[in-house]
Amino acid sequence: VPEKSVRWCAVSEHEATKCQSFRDHMKSVLPSNGPSVACVKKASHLDCIRAIAANEADAVTLDAGLVYDAYLAPNNLKPVVAEFYGSKEDPQTFYYAVAVVKKDSDFQMNQLRGRKSCHTGLGRSAGWNIPIGLLYCDLPEPRKPLEKAVANFFSGSCVPCADGTDFPQLCQLCPGCGCSTLNQYFSYSGAFKCLKDGAGDVAFVKHSTIFENLANKADRDQYELLCLDNTRKSVDEYKDCHLARVPSHTVVARSVGGKEDLIWELLNQAQEHFGKDKSKEFQLFSSPHGKDLLFKDSAHGFLKVPPRMDAKMYLGYEYITAIRNLREGTCPEAPTDECKPVKWCALSHHERLKCDEWSVNSAGKIECESAETTEDCIAKIMNGEADAMSLDGGFVYIAGMCGLVPVLAENYNTPNPNCENTAEEGYFAVAVVKSSSDLTWDNLKGKKSCHTAVGRTAGWNIPMGLLYSKINHCRFDEFFSEGCAPGSEKNSSLCKLCMGPSPNLCEPNNKEGYYGYTGAFRCLVEKGDVAFVKHQTVPQNTGGKNPDAWAKNLKEEDYELLCLDGSRKSVQEPANCHLARAPNHAVVARKDKADCVQTLLLDQQRMFGSSVTDCSSNFCLFESKTKDLLFRDDTVCLAKLHDRNTYEKYLGEEYVKAVTNLRKCSTSPLLEACTF
């Protein structure tokens, strides 16, 4: 059956031979209605990429550099299955390209000019493409030929396989630049030896190199890693201090109609029957015909790439930046230490309008990028399409797991002169009911619930975390009779109460009328029994403070808070009747943009922050008529974080633990992708 057939692309006679053997052996173990293999032979990996894009083949396994080619238009392929190395219990699908230095040296990443460098080899990922790609815009002009520019940047190097006649400085630390193990400074171990022997000041290798060459921790402690933010970290901290994370070997397919489920079904079956130590007659990860045919011989198995993970996310911002710099050879005109405009990520139409107005008023220092969901915005920040946004704590957690960092906190209570330097404790997550109802925390089952959005702190993580510890399952849509929790599955009972309008029904953005704090409260007013919101929501939307038709006649005393002990209290008493304390919303950015984002925002809030009194005739950053567009409307200022500059420190141990527990119930495709 053609639709059940996976057309594998082979790039040599030997690969084609192995592919045919793969096809025949799979036929013998799979049912006739299961997936099958067909083989397509092409002259090169690039030809395979083109063939898959043109629907003449379905899959091929590629190195990272070729995954980049596959992702570029017009190919638009995406990673679907990753080879893993190491054990099944601790599968490694990536390695980290690092810059290793001796601890007793005193320079940072931005001070490499004039140092001596040790590389694994010309054109190799960790040893050349990534470090030179990232340093590209610091190289002296002209940058072509590249080897000459690199030779003029460092004061001496060992670059195995370079042309020692044309570029003698590249071979200064290893005469001849030998391209095999005859050169003592060749490849990973050689480049590290070049550093260890004192020939070079920095070695560009992969994270495992230092562990493979120095078994003793005391010896490893004599070395450090250079980080892209111009700090240093210990060699164990390579996950937080690397030049790029590089996928090892990946199966790619078309982004649309790519048969990814079928490819996974096929490869999963293949590893069960013909994986490491499974079969004598055919081995997936070795071949009598040659090395690394179809798959790497060193692979131990396959893992399915999460569906949310596109090629940009898979390759990572640093890797793509490095490769793009090398390939395109373009550099910004502005010096790299100058802050470029900050691209703010706006959620859907209304936030985009406010962002546009901000952009106009900032004289272009702020630019705007849009996405339909918070997770899509976070993904855009990760891949460099956007730079920053302000997030609820639940999304600060997801953003943190995806490598972003908190930059500034929204403050709600501190009057202005001290606001910028004050660390507030947070706000209260509360459960609000109508005073006329007889509801308590203990009899919510079967009632109608209103949530700000799935994954948000007050509206979801805190109440559902508490609920989970009570009911011990994740079927929250069965606990409540119906509700509105924007971001839920469209057919879930937790979308039933949402107002839309269609097709935006239950979407986690302002196009859904019951989204956010004000939306969840409106849901309670019009349809629901309980709303999970922040403690300020009721006062901010009653007593005529919200002029909308649905809110203008509401009275604060018609609503009460549910306390965890089963009692109820006035909305004026959140300190004595709340579900938990929630971390304030915070601005997040990529590490490389954090300083620029902070500097610009502090400047912007001095012009457009809460010191502006007349928002009808001036642009106000923290005002949007209860819509909480871009920032919460009750923000007094954006405050510095000082040492709370990681998501764990910012959110606090207790909240991180609560959200981590709730991950069993996670519906976040982005979180799944970021923890792959």
């Epitope: 209304h350 106009v360 004289a363 928002c615 009808s616 005739s617 001036n618 642009f619 008529k625 819509k627």
Partner: nanobody
Amino acid sequence: EVQLVESGGGLVQPGGSLRLSCAASGSIFSIATMAWYRQAPGKGLELVAGITRSGSTNYRDSVKGRFTISRDNSKNTLYLQMNSLRAEDTAVYYCTDYSSRYYHDYWGQGTLVTVSS
């Protein structure tokens, strides 16, 4: 009720010029940030140029040096002078005033600009 009426669109050859006008009534025109947006066939709405109440302006990169936004507060009118027009400038152009604070969407009917030889 805010009313915005755009005019001045039409068919023009590449390299040609047009001047769009937007008459506003019922808005606090003189104190609002104003902007021109455009929507090309099958594309989303994009900001073309904006002007603050104090008259400082901002443009999208692709129109810088070719388009000029201005306002006449006494006439409650916003303008967009478009020079060196290109095929990719073809779109329906809308003006908006931000005084409503993104709370209600006030959009006129737009004016169609077609750049074609």
